[in-house]
């Protein structure tokens, strides 16, 4: 899609599995012509998209894309959950899809779960 | 055009594991999802699994959990599907697809690798 | 899982007549982004399968007109305006809202 609309490249039902106590960027990629767009992020609650008002931030340019980033430092357990990134451009709301951060809770370097077995865990939800 | 090239036809004893590549062109994977999806002979269609080839994130169905395997190499632009302890009802034409993560604008099927499973 | 049943599952035809596929799933495919995850497969003998309709109604490219989706919620259909001879094969409506996902048992269109 090429268009001078806004466009927010996450890609539908993304997920990621991460460690809690590990840093993590969790990014936003925005496509725009003229003007950057306002960003924000929000995490899922049911159905609401609650705004992520006092957290990290920041902005990473590259040549054809910019990335609206939001920093876990460290990550924490209760970061598990869906989140979306949100662009104001021209009045208009543009919200992307939402993307699923998977925690976990490491006891030990050594039981660090691998990327399937994070797939595999029952309390994942779809 | 975006196209998938798989890798050829195995036969492989009842115990033993089967590897499938397939190699996508015409897109950056980054950009997509690979699944691959397997149909035993005269048989419908049954889906195993998914990656995000961005972050290496793998997601089964339940029925293959623990037997199946998914990577993708970034750099080759190729996804694999591995399978261990095969057995003769894993007997099937293994595919591999690839979607378009943001709009599901395409789907497009590799040609399709049998995979032979008998003592 | 979500089950996707579809009817009938063998439906002869007549070339140049229509010919309608009916495809249930088990729960809504009506995803948080308002949008429904349903596709439509073609598999042509002892080819690949190729996608001929997602999101319900959207045609792929180089799909022809004579092909339509329709359908909400759980209830879907597939309809050929007037069959033709490459059309002959089989037909599988498939969920892209849940994980995992998951298949009709196939339509196999043939001549009568």
């Known amino acids: 899609k090429e268009s001078c609309d806004v466009q927010l490249y996450i890609k539908r039902q993304s997920e990621h599995s991460i460690l809690a106590g590990d840093p993590f960027e969790l990014e936003c990629p925005v496509k725009y012509c003229a003007n950057r767009p306002h960003v924000t992020w929000c995490k899922l609650n049911g159905t609401t998209c609650v705004k992520l008002e006092d957290r990290q931030t920041s902005w990473k340019e590259e040549k054809n894309i910019s990335f609206f980033i939001l920093h876990f430092e460290p990550v924490l357990p209760n970061d598990n959950g869906s989140y979306r990134c949100s662009a104001n451009f021209q009045s208009n709301l543009i919200e992307s899809h939402s993307t699923t951060l998977y925690v976990t809770d490491v006891k030990s370097a050594s039981e660090r779960p691998s990327k399937d077995e994070m797939a595999s865990r029952p309390w994942l939800l779809y | 055009q975006v196209q998938l090239v798989q890798s050829g036809a195995e036969v492989k004893k009842p115990g033993s594991s089967v590897k499938v590549s397939c190699k996508a062109s015409?897109?950056?994977?980054?950009?997509?999802?690979m699944y691959w999806v397997r149909q035993a002979p005269g048989q419908g269609l049954e889906w195993i699994g998914r990656?995000?080839?961005?972050?290496?994130?793998?997601r089964y169905a339940q029925k293959f959990q623990g037997r199946a395997t998914i990577t993708a190499d970034e750099s080759t632009s190729t996804a694999y599907m591995e399978l261990s302890s095969l057995r003769s009802e894993d007997t099937a034409v293994y595919y591999c697809?690839?979607?378009?993560?943001?709009?599901?604008?395409?789907?497009?099927w590799g040609q399709g690798t049998l995979v032979t499973v008998s003592s | 899982d979500v089950v996707m049943t579809q009817s009938p599952l063998s439906l002869p035809v007549t070339l140049g007549q229509p010919a309608s596929i009916s495809c249930r799933s088990s729960?809504?495919?009506?995803?948080?982004?308002?949008?429904?995850?349903l596709n439509w497969l073609q598999q042509r003998p002892g080819q690949s399968p190729r996608r001929l309709i997602y999101?319900?109604?959207k045609r792929d490219s180089g799909v022809p007109d004579r092909f339509s989706g329709s359908g909400s919620g759980t209830d879907f259909t597939l309809k050929i305006s007037r069959v033709e001879a490459e059309d002959l094969g089989v037909y599988y409506c498939?969920?892209?809202?849940?994980?995992?996902?998951?298949f009709g048992q196939g339509t196999k269109l043939e001549i009568k």
């Open positions: 697809a690839v979607y378009d993560g943001y709009y599901e604008s395409f789907d497009v």
């Open positions: 015409g897109v950056n994977i980054k950009d997509t999802y």
């Open positions: 990656i995000d080839p961005a972050n290496g994130y793998a």
């Open positions: 729960q809504s495919l009506l995803d948080s982004d308002g949008k429904t995850y």
């Open positions: 999101l319900v109604s």
């Open positions: 498939w969920q892209g809202t849940l994980f995992p996902r998951t």
